[in-house]
């Protein structure tokens, strides 16, 4: 079902000479990254 | 006017300890990350490390990891760096640089120089 | 790490004539909120470094228009309109996109 094809879909990036760090430095948080700059850019 | 003023550096023997300060002005220290990069002489620049607005996350160039260590006191308006276990490829001008809008470092000081030597 | 190059490293250019500066990183520089953390910095003798342009094309504070900057992904210019006496120094590209931040390794340009 949906889980093989998540779990297909997550073999084949990895096989496109993707390693498992660089999907989790993908996936870094938008917020915690803006805390290194100004910190109120683009908040409401 | 928005600047910030380095200090701290010297000449110092290879394994020995510095503390560098980088004081802030003109604008609200705190709600911006700041940066530490440093130029060997006659090279070119290097970011070294970096802390957040808040002083909850840091992060740091592998050439460092594990000697240097980033701080802040916000109620000071002032950024420091303690360098540990000193190395004669650490002599550099040390900039201080303000993380500003756009992800780019807006505002540098004048840099401070580190020269470790026997 | 991503790898930034610079092209030329050195550029004797004539007053009043135009200069250009490539960079290139060795993987793009798109980062997943769309922006490309791009920015070129100028160090004159003796001084410290000074930002001029950020993501890519946007001139900060004070900088003359005659400095732009352009380019995509992976591949950006920086050029300067008509070169003055001021302009004398070295220039830099950086990107911001992915720790560790890194730097290009400097165009020095000068007056022949």
């Known amino acids: 079902g949906g889980g093989g094809s998540k779990h297909k879909c997550f073999r084949n990036s990895l096989e496109n000479n993707e390693t498992l760090e660089s999907i989790m430095n993908t996936l870094e948080s938008e917020e915690d990254f803006r805390k290194y700059f100004y910190y109120l850019e683009g908040s409401k | 006017q928005v600047q910030v003023v380095e200090s701290g550096g010297g000449v110092v023997q290879p394994g020995r300890s510095l503390r560098l300060s980088c004081a802030a002005s003109?604008?609200?220290?705190?709600?911006?990350?700041m940066h530490w990069v440093r130029q060997a002489p006659g090279k070119g620049l290097e970011w070294v490390t970096v802390?957040?607005?808040?002083?909850?996350?840091?992060n740091y160039a592998d050439s460092v990891k594990g000697r240097f260590t980033i701080s802040r006191d916000n109620s000071k308006n002032t950024l420091y760096l303690q360098m540990n276990s000193l190395r004669a490829e650490d002599t550099a001008m040390y900039y201080c640089?303000?993380?500003?809008?756009?992800?780019?470092?807006?505002?540098w000081g004048q840099g401070t120089m580190v020269t470790v030597s026997s | 790490d991503i790898v930034m190059t610079q092209t030329p490293l050195s550029s004797p250019v004539t007053l009043g004539q135009p200069a250009s500066i490539s960079c290139r990183s060795s993987q793009s520089l798109v980062r997943s909120d769309g922006n490309t953390y791009l920015s070129w910095l100028q160090q004159r003798p003796g001084q410290p470094p000074r930002l001029l342009i950020y993501k890519i094309s946007n001139r900060f504070s004070g900088v003359p228009d005659r400095f732009s900057g352009s380019g995509a992904g992976t591949d950006f210019t920086l050029k300067i309109s008509r070169v003055e006496a001021d302009d004398v120094g070295v220039y830099y590209c950086m990107q911001t996109t992915q720790f560790p931040f890194t730097f290009g390794p400097g165009t020095k340009v000068d007056i022949k």
């Open positions: 802390i957040s607005y808040d002083g909850s996350n840091k």
């Open positions: 640089a303000r993380g500003g809008s756009g992800f780019a470092f807006d505002i």
């Open positions: 003109g604008f609200t220290f705190s709600n911006y990350g």
